[in-house]
Structures are given as structure tokens and as C-alpha cells.
């Protein structure tokens, strides 16, 4: 009896795992084995597919084959007993295009009201994603074990912290990876559950702010209790995307180690140009708080987000305000290569009633003024990046008198 070729061959690729599955054509025939050949693009000869020769089951693994994952390959299969079936050719495919992203590895750290999530690719040093390893983003689904109400969080990086949770509560989550550049969405990790801890008697420091004074940065925060010591740590912000990097390590700011006040001062040259994350922890000698929420700190914006400089042209019913680049010491203008938004406050000199204008433009009209009246104006700049959310201090107030009633044009 002629053996029939196997049918319905499926190729499953997850990360660097290459699995073939197929259907037997004739279930009634026993002791049949199956073998595969493969052929690379541009080659005429077929090569035996190692790991998939004389297989008795309907599944085989050819992960050991070192393929160029961007190169198209073709497979064929036949059944064998005393004789052999004809070959059944599988549609050619490119491994990278066919591959799915496997479930990531997840490590959780519990705080009382937060969970830190560390995510890494499920296959270490994957060949399939070798060129894309740093492009992974992740999404997760989290729920309280007791309620099952799911919350989705999209577009997170390899380290993510979820805040505003309840103490002593079990939360469960699952994570999947995505390669947005290749339109690939991965497989969810197994569900990981962790219980948040008892509430820490020492809350984390809050409202961390950085300002510049002379050649120093001044870092300030709020704290509930007195007689505490604090430590401050920093991390390059870009490393959040890549904790596998050996540089991924929170480091102490030397001048902010074991400080006894709710602020610390350190030289600007501690940080090279860049964007950093800062966090603060409190201790009373016996107990230690969890880390504060991290703040983003951009040295360029921090150092150079100076109050705007402006000129006023006075008319009878309005001011025209022309905003220029702020001046550094030495009277050189500061080049600001990030978008700013300006907040202009003005008030009648004899009154405390302030009015506000928010403008993106550098020429602003302040309308509806009374003639021959002294108005005062101050301004400050804000970054338009919500994440950085920095503001300069207000400029000194400038006071001008509006013109008489007939000079509005």
C-alpha cells in the first residue's frame, strides 16, 4: 500500500524555539516515521533537517539548527515505513516574520502600597530578537486577587512601579512583550501574585523638587516626622528601558547620604548632561521607609530653565509683551532647544487682583487694560513635556503705565 504524505504542517516559532506539528494522513498505518528536509532561498539542494529525522510522533523541534532568521526557508516532509511517501512541501517562510515573542520573565518586589515589576525577555540572548532586544516594550494586566477587576497598563519598560495600592493585599499580574517596530505582540507570562506588606510606620518622602542655586543643585522634599536621616539615589533614566545593562544600578549622591534635613545640596558637576531619576528614603535608625516615588530630573532644563526676559510696549488699552531668551551670567542668551509655554501674571499696581495668561508664542498681547494706569507684569516658563513638568521661577515684576486713551493703534 502506498504511504500518503503527511498534511497540514504547522510551523510554530516562539523566541528561539522552532516547533513543527503535522497530521498523519493515514491513522490506520502503524510504525510510520516522518522526516523533514529544508532548503534555503537561492539553493537547489535539500538538506536533512536535524532534530526532525525518523520521528515517530507528529511533532519535532529544530531549534538547534542555526538559521539566518531573516532568510526565507522552505520545508518538506514525508512519511516512511518500508517505502516512503511522496514529499509534501510546506509554504516557504521567513523565521523572523513567523516568530512570536515568548512570555517574559517577571520578578516582583512588594512594598506596602506599591509593587516594583522587573521584566526581562524570556529567552536570554535570543538570536531571534538580537537586533531588537532594546526595543521591547511591555504591557501588563493587574488585578486584586479578591476582586478580579482587571486594570491594563500599556507601554511600560523593563522596570515599572505601580503605586497607590493597598497594604496587605494580594495582587496578581501577567505581562506580555511587544515589538512595535515589527508589529509583534507576545504571549502573556504566567500569572504572578504577590502580597503587599504591612503598612510601613515610616511613609516615603514626598514632593521631591530640584532647584538651582549658584553652582549647586538643591534637592528638597517633605517628610512627616522629625529626627530622621535620609539618603538620595540616582539612576540614568534611559536605563529603565534596559535593566540588563550592567550600569543599571541606583547610586548614592555622596552629599545626600545620611542627611538629617529634608534637603541636600550638591554641586552641579555631580551630574553630566542628561536625564536622571532621583529617589529618597527615610530612616529613624531602626526602621527604613520604602523609596519615594521617583522624579525625573533633566540637567539641561534644570540648569537652564531660567525666568524669561521680556520687553513691554505700552498702548492705551493693552500691553504687547515680547519674550526673549533668558540671559546667563556673562549676559549671553541661553539657547533653549525644547518647547516652552509662558505664564504671564499681571495686575494693577494699586490692586492685588492678579490675572493670568498662558501662551506658547513669544509675543503676547495683554488686553483690556485701562488708560494711564500702572500695571505690573511677571512671567515664568514651563516645559511642555508633561513627564518633566518643570517650571522656572517668576521673573522680577516690571511695572509700566498705559498710554492715554487715543493711542490704541
Amino acid at each position: 500500500k502506498n504511504l500518503k504524505s503527511p498534511q497540514k504542517v504547522e510551523v510554530d516559532i516562539i523566541d528561539d524555539n522552532f516547533i513543527l506539528r503535522w497530521n498523519r494522513s493515514d491513522e490506520s498505518v502503524g510504525n510510520v516515521t516522518f522526516s523533514f528536509d529544508y532548503q534555503k532561498t537561492g539553493m537547489d539542494n535539500w538538506i536533512k533537517l536535524s532534530g526532525c529525522q525518523n520521528i515517530t510522533s507528529t511533532k519535532c523541534n529544530f531549534s538547534s539548527l542555526k538559521l539566518n532568521v531573516y532568510e526565507e526557508i522552505k520545508l518538506r516532509i514525508r512519511a516512511e515505513k518500508e517505502n516512503t511517501s511522496s514529499w509534501y512541501e510546506v509554504d516557504s517562510f521567513t523565521p523572523f516574520r513567523k516568530a512570536q515573542i515568548g512570555p517574559p520573565e517577571v520578578h516582583l518586589e512588594a512594598e506596602d502600597k506599591a509593587i516594583v515589576i522587573h521584566i526581562s525577555p524570556g529567552t536570554k540572548d535570543s538570536v531571534m530578537w538580537a537586533l531588537d532586544g532594546l526595543s521591547f516594550t511591555y504591557s501588563l494586566v493587574i488585578w486584586k486577587n479578591s476582586s478580579g477587576v482587571e486594570e491594563r497598563i500599556e507601554n511600560i519598560y523593563s522596570r515599572h512601579k505601580i503605586y497607590k495600592l493597598s497594604p496587605e493585599t494580594t495582587y496578581c499580574l501577567k505581562v506580555k512583550a511587544a515589538l512595535l517596530t515589527s508589529w509583534k505582540i507576545g504571549v502573556y507570562s504566567p500569572v504572578h501574585c504577590i502580597k503587599t506588606t504591612v503598612e510601613n510606620e515610616l511613609p516615603p518622602p514626598e514632593n521631591i523638587e530640584v532647584s538651582v542655586q549658584n553652582q549647586n543643585y538643591v534637592l528638597k522634599w517633605d517628610y512627616t516626622y522629625a529626627n530622621m536621616t535620609f539618603q538620595v539615589q540616582w539612576l540614568h533614566a534611559f536605563l529603565k528601558r534596559n535593566p540588563g545593562n550592567h550600569l543599571y544600578k541606583w547610586k548614592q549622591i555622596p552629599d545626600c547620604e545620611n542627611v538629617k534635613t529634608t534637603q541636600c545640596v550638591f554641586p552641579q558637576n555631580v551630574f553630566q548632561k542628561g536625564i536622571y531619576l532621583l529617589r529618597v528614603q527615610a530612616s529613624d535608625g531602626n526602621n527604613t521607609s520604602f523609596w519615594s516615588e521617583e522624579i525625573k530630573f533633566d540637567t539641561e532644563i534644570q540648569a537652564f530653565l531660567l525666568p524669561p526676559v521680556f520687553n513691554i510696549r505700552s498702548l492705551s488699552d493693552s500691553f504687547h509683551i515680547y519674550i526673549g531668551a533668558p540671559k546667563q551670567s556673562g549676559n549671553t542668551p541661553v539657547i533653549q532647544d525644547y518647547p516652552l509655554i509662558y505664564e504671564i501674571i499681571f495686575w494693577e499696581n494699586t490692586s492685588n487682583a492678579e490675572r493670568k495668561i498662558i501662551e506658547k508664542k513669544t509675543d503676547v498681547t495683554v488686553p483690556n487694560l485701562k488708560p494711564l494706569t500702572v500695571y505690573c507684569v511677571k512671567a515664568r516658563a514651563h516645559t511642555m513635556d508633561e513627564k518633566l513638568n518643570k517650571s522656572s521661577v517668576f521673573s522680577d515684576a516690571v511695572c509700566e503705565k498705559t498710554k492715554p486713551g487715543n493711542t490704541s493703534k
Epitope: 520578578h107 550592567h246 550600569l247 526602621n287
Partner: antibody, heavy 123, light 107 residues
């Protein structure tokens, strides 16, 4: 698979120093803290200190701070623990043990241990 | 330093028994607690971390519970290979500290 292989047993005189090595394999050496723990005969476990192999940052148990030196040779993925001014009560088995990832926010348990090195201090 | 107090210090039990070992810390350690098993002449082996999470490859008869200052290791049904000394360890504050150990012997 992760392996920590320690150097062999040592016999030292009081006042001398001993240097124990711990060679790591099977994982990214610079991504995890390496800890040292000792155990005197018939006694419990005592944490001595830890080192970050990527930049040699160290943390010590105050009890050992003045006598222990932890060093790293990244080229051979080896960590060394040197204990000076030895006394008879330093007779113990010394273990290296892998700690948490350096990227973790908080410290972690010791998941892999070396086989131990017996150091005997005797005149 | 945080003191870790384990009880009992020794315990006799039979194969199939359910056994519980407790560990108390002098300060709250926020679930930063590990349990280790040590057999004579061998290095300790991690069983449980984060107070409740079973290390991979460890049989499911081992379980951990507790929070705050009070933690427990339970072996649901003792097997012959479980007779050993068990240590708890806190890793919330440096220096990390261990309990004095619980020796589990065959009755």
C-alpha cells in the same frame, strides 16, 4: 546552570590572613551581588558582607568591617574574601552566596551557595 | 541589628507529619524573609523567599506564611529527605541576620 566553586580548606596561625576565592559560572557575573556568610563548627550562619562585581561597591557587617576585604576579578568571574588578624574564633566554614540582581530596588535572598571553605585557625 | 528568633530550636517528628517552624524578628521586616535547609557538611539551600514564594525546584509540601514580625515555615507531610536544620534570614536591613536554626530530627 549556576555554579559557585570555592577554593580549598586552609589552616592558619592566629594573626595571619586568609584569602578565599569563589568562582562563578552559569550566569551574568556582574548582574548579581555576591555575599559571604560564615558558619562556626556546630553554630548558625553569620552574614559578613557583599560586593557588587560590576563596580566593587561593598557593604559589611560592622563586626567584620575592619578585618574583611572583598575584591573581584571580572576577567575570571571570581570574588575574593580576605580576612585578616585571624583568631581562633574565626575557625569556620566560609560560604559565598549569590544575592539579588543589582537592578533590584531592594535586597534579595541568597539563591545559590558555594560548597564552603573550611578555615582553621590554630597555633 | 535585627534579631531573628526561631522556635523550636529542635524538633522530633515522623515521616508524614505536618511540621511548623516559626521565626520572629525584632523589627518589622516587610516580608523580606527567606527560609533555608541545611544538611550536615553541605551548604544551605534556599527554600522560600519573600516570606511566601517557593524557590523553583522546591517541593510544594514546603510553604511559607506570615507578615510584619512573625513568619512560619510549614512542611505539610515530612519526607525522609527533609530531616535537616532550617534557618530563617531577614534581608530587609543590613546586616542580614539569621535565626539560630531549628534541627528537625527523626522521632
Amino acid at each position: 546552570q549556576v555554579q559557585l566553586v570555592q577554593s580549598g580548606a586552609e589552616v592558619k596561625k592566629p594573626g595571619a590572613s586568609v584569602k578565599v576565592s569563589c568562582k562563578a559560572s552559569g550566569y551574568t557575573f556582574t548582574s548579581y551581588w555576591m555575599n559571604w556568610v560564615r558558619q562556626a563548627p556546630g553554630q548558625g550562619l553569620e552574614w559578613m558582607g557583599k560586593i557588587d562585581p560590576s563596580d566593587s561597591e561593598t557593604h559589611f557587617n560592622q563586626k567584620f568591617r575592619d578585618r574583611v576585604t572583598l575584591t573581584v576579578d571580572k576577567s575570571t568571574s571570581t570574588v575574593y574574601m580576605e580576612l585578616s588578624s585571624l583568631r581562633s574564633e574565626d575557625t569556620a566554614v566560609y560560604y559565598c552566596a549569590r544575592g539579588g540582581r543589582i537592578s533590584f530596588d531592594y535586597d534579595a535572598a541568597l539563591d545559590y551557595w558555594g560548597q564552603g571553605t573550611l578555615v582553621t585557625v590554630s597555633s | 541589628d535585627i534579631q531573628m528568633t526561631q522556635s523550636p530550636s529542635s524538633l522530633s517528628a515522623s515521616v508524614g507529619d505536618r511540621v511548623t517552624i516559626t521565626c520572629k524578628s525584632s523589627e518589622v521586616i516587610y516580608n523580606r524573609l527567606a527560609w533555608y535547609q541545611q544538611k550536615p557538611g553541605k551548604a544551605p539551600k534556599l527554600l522560600i523567599y519573600g516570606a511566601t514564594t517557593l524557590e523553583s525546584g522546591v517541593p510544594s509540601r514546603f510553604s511559607g506564611s506570615g507578615s510584619g514580625k512573625d513568619y512560619t515555615l510549614t512542611i505539610s507531610s515530612l519526607q525522609p529527605e527533609d530531616f535537616a536544620t532550617y534557618y530563617c534570614q531577614q534581608y530587609w536591613n543590613k546586616p542580614f541576620t539569621f535565626g539560630q536554626g531549628t534541627k528537625l530530627e527523626i522521632k
